[in-house]
Structures are given as structure tokens and as C-alpha cells.
């Protein structure tokens, strides 16, 4: 707000007011009057910089007086009081009410004394964000959608990831005439790593007081990556049972696993156990290609690996034997 | 009714000064600011100045300062306008008026001729 | 000062008529403009002030618009009665000022 004036009476405003569409506002005015400073005020005006005419007068004798009765209304002044407030209040602001008003006091002995008020017509958005379920393209796509729906002025939304990923974002009007509904996708070469992972839209407003944090899970369906655990190279005759693990990622969950080897069905010593494999004590060596072959939504993949049981102490080993 | 009611007409010599009343009522003196304003025949208004009744403050119109007075009498509700040092230009009806931005009453004028 | 130039400085018109006068002012005055009305051997009396708010008791035929420097008056449907001088008042600085007036006369 302006300094009150030093030796001179001097209209106390703030140079913009907010207000939101459909709501009502006050659009606040005073008289600052110094305390040996006389001044007598007849009339209060507030006009709209563009428009002819005034749209609200308050007269010493003829009261309030308005362009749009049901929608102004002077908040303070009233017949056969001091008028040192000319503060109005407006109802079911509209876009078009958006712009710069003066409010202007006609005192004597100074002359008139006015003040421009920019009145900022806002509507507060709101914000959803969603996640775009992608298969790998090996293109960039989107993966996530931000959306802030009729806002005045548009939102500003952003991305924060630690995956990268760019922004594109798009502008169409809002269902309410000047508002603004803002869209932004989160595009990226899809990838299995990315799968689960967070990114975080931030959508800031004026009406906000602090910016509004959505967090997107994202998904991304691939078929099975597929590998086998549990074989050290070091198995020897002799030695107890042991697991093989057939270890799958996927989206959607693996349906199904399978197991084989590259000769056709397992050996008797090998027995599937849905995910794993158990293998039996064996009494001579072997020398086994296995397969896991795993099975999801999107399609099947397979991991391959050659399972060797040598001669060899096996006091000094975890061991394959019958005990 | 608010109601202003000005002395009678004068007839004075160049040089000399004038002074013209203006008794109020029907309203609350204090409470707004008395004006005067002049019309030479069949020409336009002029405004001379005019008072707040409460604190005595006064505005002039700098065509007249010097030579143009105005005070109150609160205790009557009454204006006075003096106007001195009289050519016979100042010829014209002299009207008190209640301001309110514009002026919403008018007393009914008082006829002051300068001639020798 | 501020000049109110008023156009025309008479004028004739008939019962019934549209009549216009005009008011420009030689700066901006925002909207603190009154029209006066004054009939022969009588004080002015007020018909609107702020440029468009008419004064209570005022017949609606008269009407008031514009800002700035460019005022209007407007009688919609002259009457017999209305036959008189109009004056336009800038109030937004000191010295007030006036208008010359503008004499309306009925056919």
C-alpha cells in the first residue's frame, strides 16, 4: 500500500486486489486524512478505466447510487455519516470484471483525490495426475498426464524425476468462459527399469498458497526378464540337495514357468517346483543345460544355464548326496 | 425543507464592498459546505469560493482572492460572502449554494449592481 | 482552470422532441460533472450529478452520459415546462467551472 501522504490527504489503496471468478470481492478504499488537515467529502466514485461513466457514486444527500444494483454495493459509506471509506464490494465477479478501477473521493478544500486499483479476476484450478500404462515402444511416449482444469491464469505445471524426461504440455479453454485447462504429459522411452517408479508433477497457481505435489506411479508392461540363481559352478558328486531359482520380472506377474532342458524333459534328478527347481543327490556326473521359460501377458521368455556335477571331495563342499 | 434564504438586493458605488447573507435551515449546517457562486445577467455562473462551516476552512477562486470573504455564523446557520474593492463588472446575482459534490440547493439569488 | 465548452448555445425544439446538448471539458474530469437546470428568474436547480445519476424528484426523460471530457444531457421527450437554460459543472479541480449554458427554447 502507498505511504500515507505527508501533509495532504491522500486515498489509501492497494494497487491489485484479488478475487475469485463467481465469488464476491471488496475493492478497498479510504481517505487518509493527516490530523491537522480538514477536509469535508460529498461524494465517493469508483469507475472502471475504458467504460463511460461511473459505476457506483455515493452523494452526501442522494446515497448510493449503481451501475449493476445487484452486484456493487459500497461496504462502509452510509447517509449522514463521515465519508472516509468507499471501499465496494462486488458480487459474482466475472472475467470481463477483470481490469483497473479508480476510486475517487470530491472533498473540499482539496479537490478530488483518486487512486487506480487493478482488480485480478482468478479461478483456482483443479489438478489431477495419472499415469499413461505403456508397453515398450522403444520410442519416446507418454507415461504420465498432469492436468490442471480451469484456471485463471493458466497453471504452471513442471516435472521432477530422476529418470529425465520431457515435458509437453498443451493449453485449451476451460469450461468456464476464461479459464484455462492446462495438460502435460511426461514423455519417455519406456523401460523396464522405469517400471514402479515415481515421478512428481507440480502444478503452481496464484491462488495456491504453495504449489500442489502429485506423485505418479508409472507402469510400464514388458514380458519376462528372465534369469536362473542358485548355481555356484562348484556342485560335486556327494553333495546335498540344492535349489535353482528361476528369477522373473515382469509386468503383468508371470502366469507360468516352466522348465526343461535343451535335450527336451527334465531328468530324473530334477524336479520343478513352480519358480524353482529342485535338484536331487546324483551318483555320477552330469553335464545339463537347464531352461526356465517363463510366461506373462505379453509373451514368454527363457533363461538358459549349464548345470555341471563333478567328482570331487565332497567333505570340502556343500554337498549333492543322499546322506 | 432545506430552505436558503439571501438578504436583498444592493446597490453600491466602484470601490466600495458588499456583503450578501445566507440563512440556512432545515438541515444541519455544520454538516456541509457552503458555496457562492455569481451571474451577471444573461451570462453563465461563475463560483467564487466557499466554507466549511465547522472548521471555518475556506477555497477561493484566485480571480477574487484578496478581495473576497467568506465566513459563518454557526450560531444563526448563517453564510456571508464580502466581496470589496467593487468594479462594475462584479454587476450580477450572487447565489449561495450547498455543496455536495454539485450543488444541491440553491438560495435565490441576490442582486448587486456597481455603478456610480 | 478547466474550460466546459457547451454546444449549441440555444436551440429550438418541439413538444415531444429528442433533444441533446453537449459538454466538453479542456482536461479529463473523470465523471464529476453536474447539469443544471434554470428557468427564468430562478436560481439553477439540480438535475444530475457524476454525469449520469439523476437527481430524486427528476423526471426520467432527463438523462446524463459520458466521461472524461465528453458529456451529454439528453431530454428524451421534451415538455413544455422544460423550456429554460441548461449548464454543465466540472467538479473534479478547483476553480469550479461552468459552462456558457445552452437556451433551449420550444416551437
Known amino acids: 500500500w502507498p505511504p500515507p501522504g505527508t501533509g495532504d490527504v491522500v486515498v489509501q489503496a492497494p494497487t491489485q486486489v484479488p478475487g475469485f471468478l463467481g465469488d464476491s470481492v471488496t475493492l478497498p478504499c479510504y481517505l487518509q486524512v493527516p490530523n491537522m488537515e480538514v477536509t469535508h467529502v460529498s461524494q465517493l466514485t469508483w469507475a472502471r478505466h475504458g467504460e463511460s461513466g461511473s459505476m457506483a457514486v455515493f452523494h452526501q444527500t442522494q446515497g448510493p447510487s449503481y451501475s449493476e444494483s445487484k452486484r456493487l454495493e459500497f461496504v462502509a459509506a452510509r447517509l449522514g455519516a463521515e465519508l472516509r471509506n468507499a471501499s465496494l464490494r462486488m458480487f459474482g465477479l466475472r472475467v470481463e470484471d477483470e481490469g483497473n478501477y479508480t476510486c475517487l473521493f470530491v472533498t473540499f478544500p482539496q479537490g478530488s483525490r483518486s487512486v487506480d486499483i487493478w482488480l485480478r479476476v482468478l479461478a483456482k484450478p483443479q489438478n489431477t495426475a495419472e499415469v499413461q500404462k505403456v508397453q515398450l515402444t522403444g520410442e519416446p511416449v507418454p507415461m504420465a498426464r498432469c492436468v490442471s482444469t480451469g484456471g485463471r491464469p493458466p497453471a504452471q505445471i513442471t516435472w521432477h524425476s530422476d529418470l529425465g524426461g520431457m515435458p509437453n504440455t498443451s493449453q485449451v479453454p476451460g469450461f468456464l468462459s476464461g479459464t484455462v485447462t492446462v495438460t502435460s504429459l511426461w514423455i519417455l522411452v519406456p523401460s523396464s527399469q522405469v517400471d514402479g517408479k515415481n515421478v512428481t508433477c507440480k502444478v503452481e497457481h496464484e491462488s495456491f498458497e504453495k504449489p500442489q505435489l502429485l506423485t505418479v506411479n508409472l507402469t510400464v508392461y514388458y514380458p519376462p526378464e528372465v534369469s536362473i540363481s542358485g548355481y555356484d559352478n562348484n556342485w560335486y558328486l556327494g553333495q546335498n540337495e540344492a535349489t535353482l531359482t528361476c528369477d522373473a520380472r515382469s509386468n503383468p506377474e508371470p502366469t507360468g514357468y516352466n522348465w526343461s532342458t535343451t535335450m527336451g524333459p527334465l531328468p530324473p534328478f530334477a524336479v520343478a517346483q513352480g519358480a524353482q527347481l529342485l535338484i536331487r543327490p546324483v551318483d555320477k556326473p552330469i553335464n545339463t543345460t537347464l531352461i526356465c521359460n517363463v510366461t506373462n501377458a505379453l509373451g514368454a521368455r527363457q533363461a538358459e544355464l549349464t548345470v555341471q556335477v563333478k567328482e570331487g571331495p565332497p567333505s570340502e563342499h556343500s554337498g549333492i548326496s543322499r546322506n | 425543507e432545506v430552505q436558503l434564504v439571501q438578504s436583498g438586493s444592493e446597490l453600491k458605488k466602484p470601490g466600495a464592498s458588499v456583503k450578501v447573507s445566507c440563512k440556512t435551515s432545515?438541515?444541519?449546517?455544520?454538516?456541509?459546505?457552503m458555496h457562492w457562486v455569481r451571474q451577471p445577467h444573461g451570462k453563465g455562473l461563475e463560483w467564487i469560493g466557499g466554507?466549511?462551516?465547522?472548521?471555518?476552512?475556506?477555497s477561493y477562486n484566485q480571480r477574487f482572492k484578496g478581495r473576497v470573504t467568506i465566513t459563518v455564523d454557526k450560531s444563526t446557520s448563517t453564510a456571508y460572502m464580502e466581496l470589496s474593492s467593487l468594479r462594475s463588472e462584479d454587476t450580477a446575482v450572487y447565489y449561495c449554494?450547498?455543496?455536495?459534490?454539485?450543488?444541491?440547493?440553491w438560495g435565490q439569488g441576490t442582486l448587486v449592481t456597481v455603478s456610480s | 482552470d478547466i474550460q466546459m465548452t457547451q454546444s449549441p448555445s440555444a436551440m429550438s425544439a418541439s413538444v415531444g422532441d429528442r433533444v441533446t446538448i453537449t459538454c466538453k471539458a479542456s482536461?479529463?474530469?473523470?465523471?464529476?460533472v453536474a447539469w443544471y437546470q434554470q428557468k427564468p428568474g430562478q436560481p439553477p436547480k439540480a438535475l444530475i450529478y457524476?454525469?449520469?445519476y439523476r437527481y430524486s424528484g427528476v423526471p426520467d426523460r432527463f438523462s446524463g452520459s459520458g466521461s472524461g471530457t465528453d458529456f451529454t444531457l439528453t431530454i428524451s421527450s421534451l415538455q413544455a415546462e422544460d423550456l429554460a437554460e441548461y449548464f454543465c459543472?466540472?467538479?473534479?479541480?478547483?476553480?469550479?467551472?461552468f459552462g456558457q449554458g445552452t437556451k433551449l427554447e420550444i416551437k
Open positions: 466554507i466549511h462551516p465547522n472548521q471555518g476552512e475556506t
Open positions: 482536461q479529463n474530469v473523470g465523471t464529476n
Open positions: 449554494a450547498r455543496w455536495t459534490g454539485d450543488f444541491d440547493y
Open positions: 432545515g438541515y444541519t449546517f455544520t454538516e456541509y459546505t
Open positions: 457524476s454525469a449520469s
Open positions: 459543472q466540472q467538479y473534479e479541480s478547483y476553480p469550479y467551472t
